[in-house]
Amino acid sequence: YNNFRKSMDSIGKKQYQVQHGSCSYTFLLPEMDNCRSSSSPYVSNAVQRDAPLEYDDSVQRLQVLENIMENNTQWLMKLENYIQDNMKKEMVEIQQNAVQNQTAVMIEIGTNLLNQTAEQTRKLTDVEAQVLNQTTRLELQLLEHSLSTNKLEKQILDQTSEINKLQDKNSFLEKKVLAMEDKHIIQLQSIKEEKDQLQVLVSKQNSIIEELEKKIVTATVNNSVLQKQQHDLMETVNNLLTMMSTSNSAKDPTVAKEEQISFRDCAEVFKSGHTTNGIYTLTFPNSTEEIKAYCDMEAGGGGWTIIQRREDGSVDFQRTWKEYKVGFGNPSGEYWLGNEFVSQLTNQQRYVLKIHLKDWEGNEAYSLYEHFYLSSEELNYRIHLKGLTGTAGKISSISQPGNDFSTKDGDNDKCICKCSQMLTGGWWFDACGPSNLNGMYYPQRQNTNKFNGIKWYYWKGSGYSLKATTMMIRPADF
């Protein structure tokens, strides 16, 4: 044969032309539309991606591949039929027209056709393997999706049951809250009613209180009048008793005293029912010895035993140790009760000491000591004070710790001088210290710049002499 060429016709079919001598053989083969030519950029593993395809996309592609396979199968069948038909025709023609040496050409053509068929078959096999691979992958993905779906379904079921539980709980709580609200409303109503009742009661009580206050004012006026009368009577009675006891003892010393209840201090007098200011007879602790004292039954709840009073300068306070020991002056006026009695009394239980002061300008102040006692004479009636409160200075004007008592004839101070002689009066001098309530009495307009006057430094300063002073004691548990 002269030549053999392959070309494409106008409609895209493959054309095999064989020239042999005067004879020319042309074979037309159909090209499948859905198949790629061997020269096309085809990658056999293009479907094997790392990232999984979406489920719907995979199904679509699978369908496309199935169609391709089906088309290929049909095409193969057509090709076989076509080859058989052509072979029959060719064989008839060859038998009719061909010479002996054309047999080789025919065999070559047959071989080429077989090669073509083999090539197509190989391609189909490749596609088939790819489809199978993709199918397997898709099956795995489907299985994964199925498992994931099952898991999600389980989670949804769990969450649904949880939501149901929470809804049940919520409804229970809502019911409870509603019940509580109802209860609260009822309580509020009852409270409102009670409030209204109380307001009525308060207004009633206010009117009663107003009436009582009016009555109290009237009673107070009457009481003060009665108290004055009683005080006057008491003084008269006391004077009479003194006169009678003097005259009786002069006439008949064997007449026994009328038995009477003894009081240790004014607090006991007060508790026995004697609640009027005045002079009362007190008995020394564990003794029959008596002493007269003035009792303040009004100030700060009453029951106060007055141990010192200055008010007008009528009594001389520049006295001896013995006089300060036993006491001197007039209990209804200026006086000193006595160190021995005060020492013994404050030895029995805890006492408080209150010192009340008046200046010449009409001002008053006080110092209150929560703890007070005097040591025995052996320790020079040393003063002990603790727990200061009051308006007469934040610092104690009686030196702390307490000092021994000193008089003009008993110098126990901490000064090389003799404070009692220099400043006059008996007192718990330091060296000489910030106070002396037993100093010289100076009248108004002569009371300033006096170093030896009635001094309470932390209220009025060093040179000011006070108008009036009162020292009083009472049991701490009164």
């Epitope: 239980q349 805890r350 703890h371 006692y373 052996e378 320790l379």
Partner: nanobody, 120 residues
Framework: EVQLVESGGGLVQAGGSLRLSCAAS????????MGWFRQAPGKEREFVAA?????SSTDSAQGRFTISRDNAKNTVYLQMNSLKPEDTAVYYC????????????????WGQGTQVTVSS
């Protein structure tokens, strides 16, 4: 002059006993309340026990310490049993009020103190 002199202190092992004495002079002893106080280093003086002239007493040591007095000898005693290391202190004798006060304020005469050391 009024004086109080303590004696009987010393070193003792934990669980042991000591008897402190306090002799008074120059004061009407029988009418005074006598008390024992102690002071550990860096701490305030604290009440231990007190006894009145008639013999009534009060203490703070849960029955381990007993106070007593002999008015004829003008002496007060403190018997300390089952001693603990925390009982280590200087023990002071004091004379005071006629009532059984626990506050140092109410005692106006003090001894110089005696050291008690309890080792563990």
């Amino acid at each position: 002059e009024v004086q109080l002199v303590e004696s009987g202190g010393g070193l003792v092992q934990a669980g042991g006993s000591l008897r402190l004495s306090c002799a008074a002079s120059g004061r009407t002893f029988s009418s005074s309340v006598m008390g024992w106080f102690r002071q550990a280093p860096g701490k305030e003086r604290e009440f231990v026990a007190a006894i009145s002239g008639s013999g009534s007493s009060t203490d703070s040591a849960q029955g381990r310490f007993t106070i007593s007095r002999d008015n004829a000898k003008n002496t007060v005693y403190l018997q300390m049993n089952s001693l603990k290391p925390e009982d280590t202190a200087v023990y002071y004798c004091a004379a005071g009020r006629a009532f059984l006060a626990r506050d140092t304020f109410y005692y106006d005469i003090w001894g110089q103190g005696t050291q008690v050391t309890v080792s563990s």
